[in-house]
């Protein structure tokens, strides 16, 4: 069966939303009117892992392109990245690990808590304009919230 | 008054190793992304590394990646730069700087010179 | 990498003048821009950042203006402390970049 996905947008809970910084990095900046334009539709594909009732592992693929974010050891360091793939071959159920995400939603916020490196969540910094990147701490003054807007097809 | 205060320039063989600190004050250290930018003599400025408050996020110039560390003591209001196999290219003042807003530099310290020669 | 080109790289000017010195980005960065004033023997100054936004106690004889890829700092009234060294710098995407500088010298 074809893998499900939905498309979504993506604020964290400073209400900042994700656009495209360069070709393979995104930043998280306050948007209004016009320019809520630049943020990045994600494609949301509910892959195969290991899933609870507030877990559900998810592969964020941006929308129209063949760009999913990973997450891969660069200087010995968990780090996030936007990842080229073979557009005929993904998405797919089977994702590898570094693409996979534990969707986890607690009190109507999202965290994204990478497959490959427990404990390392899709964070974004207090600060305007600055990247997403992947984050090993919760709690502190980096942001690991999120909420989902559904973009319609 | 902000005020950042740079030390561990000097002279260095070609594929030795330097470790730069910032000493910052003035204001809340912690809450602050802080630039390192470098600027060779008589030449332009050169963004070289950025680290986001809790270190979490690092970035660095690809004339400098896998060469060059960027981290901080906020206990100690410091930000280090720790190079490592220096080139004679790395010839500059170092410079600090505080993050304002969107990704200026809004303060600067007053630099410190590395000269990597033999 | 985005690519930030200044010019002129040098300009002969009096004091009083009115002068204009232009930033062109390689690709589209929104309002992301800033502008600072360089001293021989000192660390660079926050003129103005966001593209138009003048940083607290810089005069406002300095304005920048622009759009997308171009963009230009005006000095109107030029004195004789604004003889420098001026830089663009995109803070669109990492990494960094700053335009090669334009130098304001005494005509």
């Known amino acids: 069966a074809p893998v499900r996905s939905l498309n979504c947008t993506l604020r964290d809970s400073q209400q900042k939303s994700l656009v495209m910084s360069g070709p393979y990095e995104l930043k998280a900046l306050h948007l209004q009117g016009q320019d809520m334009e630049q943020q990045v539709v994600f494609s949301m594909s509910f892959v195969q892992g290991e899933e609870s009732n507030d877990k559900i592992p998810v592969a964020l693929g941006l929308k129209e392109k063949n760009l999913y974010l990973s997450c891969v050891l660069k200087d010995d360091k968990p780090t996030l990245q936007l990842e080229s793939v073979d557009p005929k071959n993904y998405p797919k159920k089977k994702m590898e690990k570094r693409f996979v995400f534990n969707k986890i939603e607690i009190n109507n916020k999202l965290e994204f808590e990478s497959a490959q490196f427990p404990n390392w969540y899709i964070s974004t910094s207090q600060a305007e304009n600055m990247p997403v990147f992947l984050g090993g701490t919760k709690g502190g003054q980096d942001i690991t919230d999120f909420t989902m807007q559904f973009v319609s097809s | 008054e902000v005020q950042l205060l740079e030390s561990g320039g000097g002279l260095v063989q070609p594929g030795g190793s330097l470790r730069l600190s910032c000493a910052a004050s003035g204001f809340t250290f912690s809450k602050y992304f802080m630039f390192w930018v470098r600027q060779a003599p008589g030449k332009g400025l050169e963004w070289v590394s950025v680290i986001s408050p809790s270190g979490g996020m690092t970035r660095y110039a690809d004339s400098v990646k896998g060469r060059f560390t960027i981290s901080r003591d906020n206990s100690k209001n410091t930000l280090y730069l720790q190079m490592n196999s220096l080139r004679a290219e790395d010839t500059a003042v170092y410079y600090c700087?505080?993050?304002?807003?969107?990704?200026?530099?809004?303060?600067w310290g007053q630099g410190t010179l590395v000269t990597v020669s033999s | 990498d985005i690519q930030m080109t200044q010019s002129p790289s040098s300009v002969s000017a009096s004091v009083g003048d009115r002068l204009t010195i232009i930033c062109r980005a390689s690709q589209d960065i929104n309002r992301w821009l800033a502008w600072y004033q360089q001293t021989p023997g000192n660390a660079p100054k926050l003129l103005i950042h966001s593209l138009t936004s003048l940083q607290s106690g810089v005069p406002s004889r300095f304005s920048g203006s622009g759009s997308g890829t171009d963009f230009t700092l005006t000095i109107n009234s030029l004195q004789p402390e604004d003889f420098a060294t001026y830089y663009c710098?995109?803070?669109?995407?990492?990494?960094?970049?700053f335009g090669g500088g334009t130098k304001v010298e005494i005509k």
């Open positions: 700087a505080r993050v304002g807003y969107g990704g200026n530099s809004d303060y």
């Open positions: 710098q995109q803070a669109d995407s990492f990494p960094l970049t």
